[in-house]
Interface confidence: low
């Protein structure tokens, strides 16, 4: 993950990243919107791999928990919002079918704006 | 991917998302910074799965290619920047070893700020 602070930059929204195991995650939402169970281990040729994910979300403790940094507040309301992406994971659906499905995981914290209509 | 526009919101940075196959990707950077080859297919219990990834990056054609939307320009310079995250992929390293490694993929477009020191 590139670190803007190293270049003397600030993010409009502060985020935190962490490795999340399937054991911590337990369930996820797949592309069809259904809830699936995320399996803890994935069989590979040389045994089993622990299934885990690199997740990034908005920092609930940070400066930007109330709104985005650097916004022109005269014209905009702002909010930092965690966005999601899809990654493939070994899962089990409600019918106990095990398979590789794309699930949604938190991957970023972005700023969304709503325009101030009048003063 | 949640769509702010549906809620009457705008993103500070415009992004585009697409599914990218391993064939299109060919290589990637792993967590140690080494270049690895991304294999086109993954063996699973019932045959093979095409390996592909959901990628999001800054829209080079969008309004925000020059800077972020909604920023207080009196105090800040801004730039939309593609950020990366890690996903597990079946890869081959320079030593011809095939294995599951975390590789970097584009997952978001965020706004970075630098403060304007003088007027």
């Amino acid at each position: 993950h590139s670190d803007p602070a190293r270049r003397g930059e600030l993010s409009v929204c502060d985020s935190i990243s962490e490795w999340v195991t399937a054991a911590d995650k337990k369930t996820a939402v797949d592309m069809s919107g259904g809830t699936v169970t995320v399996l803890e281990k994935v069989p590979v040729s040389k045994g089993q791999l622990k299934q885990y994910f690199y997740e990034t979300k908005c920092n609930p403790m940070g400066y930007t928990k109330e709104g985005c940094r650097g916004i022109d507040k005269r014209h905009w309301n702002s909010q930092c919002r965690t966005t999601q992406s899809y990654v493939r994971a070994l899962t089990m659906d409600s019918k106990k079918r095990i398979g590789w499905r794309f699930i949604r995981i938190d991957t970023s914290c972005v700023c969304t704006l709503t325009i101030k209509r009048g003063r | 991917h949640s769509d702010p526009a549906r809620r009457g919101e705008l993103s500070v940075c415009d992004s585009i998302s697409e599914w990218v196959t391993a064939a299109d990707k060919k290589t990637a950077v792993d967590m140690s910074g080494g270049t690895v080859t991304v294999l086109e297919k993954v063996p699973v219990s019932k045959g093979q799965l095409k390996q592909y990834f959901y990628e999001t990056k800054c829209n080079p054609m969008g309004y925000t290619k020059e800077g972020c939307r909604g920023i207080d320009k009196r105090h800040w310079n801004s730039q939309c920047r593609t950020t990366q995250s890690y996903v597990r992929a079946l890869t081959m390293d320079s030593k011809k070893r095939i294995g599951w490694r975390f590789i970097r993929i584009d997952t978001s477009c965020v706004c970075t700020l630098t403060i304007k020191r003088g007027r």
């Epitope: - | 792993d30 967590m31 140690s32 080494g34 390293d93 320079s94 030593k95 011809k96 070893r97 490694r101």
Partner: antibody, heavy 121, light 107 residues
Framework: DVQLVESGGGVVRPGESLRLSCAAS????????MSWVRQAPGEGLEWVSG??????????YYADSVKDRFTVSRDNSKNTLYLQMNSLRAEDTAVYYC????????????WGLGTLVTVSS | EIVLTQSPGTLSLSPGERATLSCRAS???????LAWYQQRPGQAPRLLIY???TRATGIPARFSGSGSGTEFTLTISSLQSEDFAVYYC????????FGGGTKVEIK
């Protein structure tokens, strides 16, 4: 000068366990991939196991003949490579060499003198 | 798995003579991913050649490697007393495997 010194060999009965160590010096141990290679008495060389350096999350690799019985690990703070050998068999009798993998691929540019493991009832 | 077959098993030569050792692979080895090692009695193996023909650091010019595909050769142009040893080839196009070795002995 690069030095690799193996220890921990000895005589054990079939089914028993043994842990080999390899103390490394003369190079930045943590960043290099390392391997164990063995040589049965009067026989040729056989690659046993390898482990990636710090850039590769210390991922282990094994030959089919030892998979599920041997475990390779490393302690970068101690500049030491380990090989935990469980469920030993007579055919595991060999001199076990610790070897530093070359950066460009899995061949071995430095070797230790080896430690002898004898599995016999 | 790539199987490497070395020949001859034993080579009896006199000092000063030329030694030619062969290593044949069960399938083609990409980009000459082959190494040669020397092992003297009671010593650890020593890397001589990698990538088929590149001499390792400190290896004398009398040692040379050649070949591609499935046929590889190690040549010692003029045998010195310290060269009498066992020589192994090793491929790294796949998981590492070694040949059975060629013993070069004094005639």
């Amino acid at each position: 000068d690069v030095q690799l010194v193996e220890s921990g060999g000895g005589v054990v009965r079939p089914g028993e366990s043994l842990r080999l160590s390899c103390a490394a010096s003369g190079f930045t141990f943590s960043i290099y991939d390392m391997s164990w290679v063995r040589q049965a008495p009067g026989e040729g060389l056989e690659w046993v196991s390898g482990i990636r350096g710090s850039g590769g999350d210390a991922v282990p690799y094994y030959a089919d003949s030892v998979k599920d019985r041997f475990t390779v690990s490393r302690d970068n703070s101690k500049n030491t490579l380990y090989l935990q050998m469980n469920s030993l068999r007579a055919e595991d009798t060999a001199v076990y060499y610790c070897a530093k993998e070359n950066n460009r691929s899995i061949f071995f540019d430095y070797w230790g003198l080896g430690t002898l493991v004898t599995v016999s009832s | 798995e790539i199987v490497l077959t070395q020949s001859p098993g034993t080579l009896s030569l006199s000092p000063g003579e030329r030694a030619t050792l062969s290593c044949r692979a069960s399938r083609s080895i990409g980009r000459s991913f082959l190494a040669w090692y020397q092992q003297r009695p009671g010593q650890a193996p020593r890397l001589l050649i990698y990538d088929g023909s590149t001499r390792a650091t400190g290896i004398p010019a009398r040692f040379s490697g050649s070949g591609s595909g499935t046929e590889f050769t190690l040549t010692i142009s003029s045998l010195q007393s310290e060269d009498f040893a066992v020589y192994y080839c090793q491929q790294y196009d796949d998981w590492p495997s070694f040949g059975g070795g060629t013993k070069v002995e004094i005639k």
